[in-house]
């Protein structure tokens, strides 16, 4: 009778993560009697995957009934495959020996490759907000994919970005890989509603790439522009001074009125109007009793926006002049305001 041969017909097997791998092995003879064992890798450090004789291998099932005496099919199935299962698997026939069974013949090996999907890309922006015209960096990370080949693209509002650097780690062979990319984005005043998108394409995704997004509203700070104007009111001894705070983002804003450098009133922006570009407008009024002042009054609107150093705009109120003669151009400007916070 010809000497037993161990046949592993598949040189390689490709399996998607989470699926079951079938590793085929047959023997050409029943003799010499002895068990089959499956190993991952070769040499002294090889890992036992299945032992026909003893042990508990919860993820492994045999294709045929190995307790049948006439069985020569030693194929196994390994369930719930992960990238860590990748490697070369050997079906090894032992003959019975004492005290231990003796390795008799090995199959040629089957290389198990695992296709694993990348994790959903996570996009993160800078820790602190930045103002328009500044360049900010966004990072995109995705992990656990195999094989190594992967494509990553960056978009801002649908427009592909070109200023980015991407690394796939590790450089050498591994069971799975990670991708890390950093893109540079120049902020504009119109970016409150903008999105930065990181798109990852991989063979496991069947042409349906994964996307991670970051809203520039989390990153941008648009500082306000201030305008202080004076309007007459019916009462002859009163003047209405308005401070228009325009085109700011985010909404967090505190306004302080100063009369000749002394704090008159402080308020926090609450009822604001939103512009189409996502920025906000707000208006504050100060009613000044002119008769209470003998000298000219310097009115200052001081705004602290989003924890930044305060910006201010001043207006000189001439007490000597008649109130109605001052700021005659301002009433028309205010008619378009949605908010009338009159104090």
């Amino acid at each position: 009778e010809e000497e037993l041969q161990v046949i592993q017909p598949d040189k390689s097997v490709l399996v998607a993560a989470g699926e079951t791998a079938t590793l085929r092995c047959t023997a050409t003879s029943l003799i010499p009697v002895g068990p089959i064992q499956w190993f991952r890798g070769a040499g002294p450090g090889r890992e036992l995957i299945y032992n026909q004789k003893e042990g508990h291998f919860p993820r492994v099932t045999t294709v045929s009934e190995l307790t049948k005496r006439e069985n020569m099919d030693f194929s196994i199935r390994i369930g719930n495959i992960t990238p860590a299962d990748a490697g070369t698997y050997y079906c090894v026939k032992f003959r019975k020996g004492s005290p231990d069974d003796v390795e008799f013949k090995s199959g040629a090996g089957t290389e198990l490759s695992v296709r694993a999907k990348p994790s959903a890309p996570v996009v993160s922006g800078p820790a602190a907000r930045a103002t328009p015209q500044h360049t900010v960096s966004f990072t995109c990370e995705s992990h656990g994919f195999s094989p190594r080949d992967i494509t990553l693209k960056w978009f801002k509002n649908g427009n592909e970005l070109s200023d980015f650097q991407t690394n796939v780690d590790p450089v050498g062979e591994s069971v799975s890989y990670s991708i890390h990319s950093t893109a540079k984005v120049v902020l504009t005043r119109e970016d409150v509603h903008s999105q930065v998108i990181c798109e990852v394409a991989h063979v496991t995704l069947q042409g349906d790439p994964l996307r991670g997004t970051a809203n520039l509203s989390e990153t941008i700070r648009v500082p306000p522009t201030l305008e202080v104007t004076q309007q007459p009111v019916r009462a002859e001894n009163q003047v209405n001074v308005t401070c228009q705070v325009r085109k700011f983002y985010p909404q967090r804003l505190q306004l302080t009125w100063l009369e000749n450098g002394n704090v008159s009133r402080t308020e926090t922006a609450s009822t604001v109007t939103e512009n189409k570009d996502g920025t906000y407008n707000w208006m504050s009024w100060l009613l000044v009793n002119v008769s209470a002042h003998r000298d000219d009054v310097k009115l200052t609107c001081q705004v602290e926006h989003d924890g930044q150093p305060a910006v201010s705009k001043s207006h000189d109120l001439k007490v000597s002049a008649h109130p109605k003669e001052q700021g005659s151009n301002t009433a028309a400007e205010n008619t378009g305001s949605n908010e009338r916070n009159i104090y």
Epitope: E1, S29, L30, I31, P32, V33, G34, P35, I36, Q52, K53, E54, L66, T67, K68, R69, N71, R95, K96, G97, S98, P99, V102
Partner: antibody, heavy 120, light 107 residues
């Protein structure tokens, strides 16, 4: 025809030795192990030991260690069991059996048995 | 060593009866258990191997079950030629050990 043919009955005196043969035919002798099992009159089965017909490795029952030797001759497809320093309680029928399990030990083919009587 | 305890040691039954013999191992032996039938003056004959596999040529009225430590041999309908002594044997590891035997006698 697949069979194991054993040598004939033996009568031995205490302290003597006996060598029982077991000739295999009809199958590849080197592919299987051979175990020796004995049965004293009116008693159950007692495993004595095992030999690989392929590599010659052996494993003996503790109580017989030092008194028993099992060998094979692959050229004649014959297994031998020698038991030394015989005692009266060694009186038994001695069977050779082919061990056929792949991951386990069981015996699918038996010789007819050799009666060994130890008596002064 | 692994001890094999067989019960009962003897059973009286009639032709057509269902007979059950049990065997308990002193430690787990997976499915590596065999059952043999022996008639007076004859060598044992293998009936069941690996706990539940019927040896080629053995009638299907014989069946085996069990795993770990507890095993059963069942003769579904006893025939005249089945009156004999039955032995279990563990084949998991050396030293190989046999149960004490169960004698099936005619009632």
């Amino acid at each position: 025809q697949v069979q194991l043919v054993q040598s004939g009955a033996e009568v031995k005196k205490p302290g003597a030795s006996v060598k029982v043969s077991c000739k295999a035919s009809g199958y590849t002798f080197g592919g299987y192990g051979i175990s020796w099992v004995r049965q004293a009159p009116g008693q159950g089965l007692e495993w004595m030991g095992w030999i690989s017909a392929y590599g010659g490795e052996t494993n003996y029952a503790q109580k017989l260690q030092g008194r028993v030797t099992m060998t094979t001759d692959t050229s004649t497809s014959t297994a031998y069991m020698e038991l030394r320093s015989l005692r009266s309680d060694d009186t038994a029928v001695y069977y050779c059996a082919r061990e056929a399990g792949s991951s386990w030990y069981d015996f699918d083919l038996w010789g007819r048995g050799t009666l060994v009587t130890v008596s002064s | 060593d692994i001890q094999m305890t067989q019960s009962p040691s003897s059973v009286s039954a009639s032709v057509g009866d269902r007979v059950t013999i049990t065997c308990r191992a002193s430690q787990g032996i997976s499915s590596w258990l065999a059952w043999y039938q022996q008639k007076p003056g004859k060598a044992p004959k293998l009936l069941i191997y690996a706990a539940s596999n019927l040896q080629s040529g053995v009638p299907s009225r014989f069946s085996g079950s069990g795993s770990g430590t507890d095993f059963t041999l069942t003769i579904s309908s006893l025939q005249p030629e089945d009156f004999a002594t039955y032995y279990c044997q563990q084949g998991a590891s050396f030293p190989i050990t046999f149960g004490g035997g169960t004698k099936v006698e005619i009632k």
